[in-house]
């Protein structure tokens, strides 16, 4: 059995689950947040938690607009205790093989161990090795940024192109966008999609003499990445007199497959590796973050790591009642499994964070999109919320309609930084943004009843259309400023929220078998596209589509 870390097969077996079911029926489904505020003057005080980062900056997490009361919170914490969330958490932080289906440690937390405390996997203290990779990243990024590292014609590097997919792309894309304010020396570009348009459009805007390509593939065999990398190499050689010796100055590898890296032509001195205990969607903290270090500078990259480390410390050291990521995860379970919510909205009120929901989508859905537990049985409950989001206020002009007046309960996280990096027009933009951040959460909670609608002059059949039911839950996350440390903390918060959900559901949040089948079938079909024969080996639909494609291609 893979169930060596938990002593239950299904979350529904836990006494607190049944208790929560009863509480939901007796009070949860009829609970009015508006009334809870009226009943308890200290509700905000009790249900907001402030996280203090390593640099003294703060992030406020306001859970008070959620569909909970003291009894519900207590029962959720009971559920966490019965599911032994802290036991699994401690096993993860001790380097135990909690990724049971792949028999691996889950140790991305060791990548941000800037206190350099000993952290062991299989008897090896990996802290010196992690530190060594960071030293290599620091040295390399500083050489490139300073212009000491030169291209084959002696010009300094101006552009970095990261070629990777999934975890080797989403994290660096999101972080470089989020921390654009801290950039200035280099431009970064990201190529992920196998669609030739992605690489073609990128190569149009860079100069081979001043471009550094980072090939991000742990195994150096990822089909999309290696295809794009070879296209980039061929382009580079065609522009530089077909001299392979120039490759060393313009290509680096974020990989552990030394043989393939060398075969590609990359100098293995410019190979940045990471261990098997780093999962793709948790790899932005590793050498995969080299594009981030190049873009914002190593010191800022380290601050990013330290922000995450501060949340790790909070998660491991704070009692459950005040444990911010744990509470976030428990609320998600409450909505998912007792209210039947299917989705989770994350709306950053910050243009720099425009890729944050996409990043969290992979983090959450690839981690918890599972239907078999650690006890090797199928769940009899819902797991893995569908996470979506877009920056606000844009989102208010698209899907917020459904959030306010639709038939589905959509628990939402709103994120705002009090201080803008661009306080233009005497902070006018920032005040408008903030007013919407506060107003949306308030509107979702208080709603607007028939009486108010009528008082505003609406009559007849129009009245119900203007009614807002309210009582729609939000968590407001208010940071002081989006700095590298703040961003690191926010990502680590969602990592541990995801961890908590997975621990309660008793699923392995750290494998991704679901990505395999499509890849295997694509290889088979790929060969079929190389010839002109009519295909009849699949189902009628797939055959029909392939044959039509071949005819039109």
């Amino acid at each position: 059995s893979n169930n060596s870390f938990t002593n239950f097969k299904l979350a529904t077996e836990l006494p607190a689950w049944s208790k929560l079911q009863k509480i939901y029926e007796s009070q949860g489904k009829t609970l009015s947040v508006k009334q809870e505020f009226q009943k308890d003057a200290k509700r905000f005080e009790k249900l907001n938690k402030t996280f203090t980062n390593y640099d003294g900056s703060k992030i406020l997490f306001d859970y008070s607009k959620n569909l909970v009361n003291d009894e519900i919170i207590a029962a959720l914490i009971e559920l966490a205790k019965e599911a032994n969330v802290t036991g699994l958490r401690d096993a993860m932080f001790k380097g135990e093989h909690i990724n049971s289906t792949e028999d691996r440690a889950v140790y991305h937390v060791a990548l941000r161990n800037r206190a350099n405390k000993p952290m062991y996997v299989d008897g090896v203290n990996v802290a010196p090795e992690v530190d060594s990779v960071l030293k290599h990243m620091k040295e390399f990024s500083e050489q490139v940024r300073s212009g000491e590292w030169k291209g084959y014609t002696g010009k300094k590097i101006t552009d970095v192109v990261n070629i990777g997919i999934g975890g080797s792309d989403l994290g660096p894309v999101m972080v470089t966008e989020a921390l654009k304010h801290y950039a200035g020396v280099l431009d970064v570009h990201f190529v992920s999609n196998i669609d030739g348009t992605h690489i073609a459009e990128t190569l149009k805007v860079v100069d081979p003499e001043t471009t550094l390509f980072l090939i991000a593939s742990k195994t150096f065999t990822t089909a999309e990445t290696i295809t794009n990398a070879n296209t980039a190499k061929n382009w580079f050689l065609s522009k530089t007199g077909n001299d392979p010796s120039h490759i060393a100055k313009h290509f680096a590898a974020l990989s552990t497959n030394e043989t393939e890296v060398a075969k590609f032509g990359i100098d293995t001195k410019n190979m940045f590796g990471f261990e098997s205990w780093v999962g793709g969607r948790y790899s932005v903290w590793s050498a995969i973050g080299l594009s981030v270090a190049l873009y914002i500078g190593y010191d800022n990259f380290e601050a990013f790591l330290k922000g995450a480390e501060a949340v790790d410390n909070h998660f491991t050291q704070t009692p459950l009642e005040d444990n911010i990521p744990l509470l976030g995860g428990l609320l998600s379970v409450w909505y998912n499994n007792f209210f039947g919510a299917q989705t989770h909205l994350v709306a950053p009120f910050d243009q720099y964070l425009h890729r944050f929901p996409a990043y969290l989508q992979q983090l959450s859905m690839e981690s918890n999109g599972k239907s078999v537990t650690r006890g090797n049985v199928f769940t009899d409950y819902s797991t893995g919320s569908i996470l979506f989001g877009e920056p606000a206020t844009n989102a208010q002009h698209s899907f917020f309609q459904l959030v306010h007046q639709g038939t589905k309960l959509i628990p939402s996280d709103f994120i705002l930084a009090a201080q803008s990096h661009n306080p233009i027009e005497n902070k006018l933009h920032q005040k408008m943004l903030a007013s919407n951040f506060f107003a949306q959460a308030e509107a979702l909670m208080v709603g607007k009843d028939e009486e108010q609608v009528k008082a505003e002059g609406a009559t007849g059949g129009l009245v119900p259309h203007k009614v807002f039911s309210g009582n729609r839950p939000t968590t407001s996350i208010l940071a002081q400023k989006i700095t590298p440390a703040t961003l690191g903390a926010l990502i680590a918060y969602y990592e541990h929220v995801t961890f908590t959900e997975g621990a309660i559901w008793n699923i392995n949040s750290f494998d991704q078998w679901g990505v395999e089948l499509g890849k295997v079938l694509a290889k088979v079909i790929g060969k079929e596209l190389d010839n002109s024969s009519t295909i009849s080996t699949h189902d009628a639909s797939t055959n029909g589509l392939i044959n039509q494609f071949k005819e039109w291609m």
């Epitope: 996997v121 008897g123 090896v124 203290n125 990996v126 010196p128 090795e129 530190d131 060594s132 990779v133 960071l134 030293k135 290599h136 040295e139 552990t256 497959n257 030394e258 043989t259 060398a262 293995t268 190979m271 940045f272 590796g273 990471f274 261990e275 050498a287």
Partner: nanobody, 117 residues
Framework: QVQLVESGGGLVQPGGSLRLSCAAS????????MGWYRQAPGKQRELVST???????DYAVSVKGRFTISRDNAKNTVYLQMNNLNSEDTAVYYC???????????WGQGTQVTVSS
């Protein structure tokens, strides 16, 4: 605690063979390039042979064709098979590990190899 423990040294006649072993503990062995160095009395320490994480090997000119380096990642051990030994090969042989992804290295305590009739 990191340890590189060499074994297999000793006294051997010219033309004879020895197999040195270096057992590593406390490191992520598969992520280290491993090497053998030697130091003869009154001389500088010199590189004998290296093997990368991917298994690529390199040898000093003086030992090429006689010595073979290999590694067993499952056993966290690197070997040096030394054939057709001669008196010039007499030295203390040191095991060395170099982390493939950054400036981190470790040395063993050394094992004495003496080639003499």
């Amino acid at each position: 605690q990191v340890q590189l423990v060499e074994s297999g040294g000793g006294l051997v006649q010219p033309g004879g063979s020895l197999r040195l072993s270096c057992a590593a503990s406390g490191i992520s062995f598969h992520s280290y390039a491993m090497g053998w160095y030697r130091q003869a009395p009154g001389k500088q320490r010199e590189l004998v042979s290296t093997i990368t994480t991917g298994g690529s090997t390199d040898y000093a000119v003086s030992v090429k064709g006689r010595f073979t380096i290999s590694r067993d990642n499952a056993k966290n051990t690197v070997y040096l098979q030394m054939n057709n030994l001669n008196s010039e090969d007499t030295a203390v042989y040191y095991c060395h590990s170099q982390y493939a992804y950054g400036p981190l290295e470790y040395w063993g305590q050394g094992t004495q190899v003496t080639v003499s009739s």
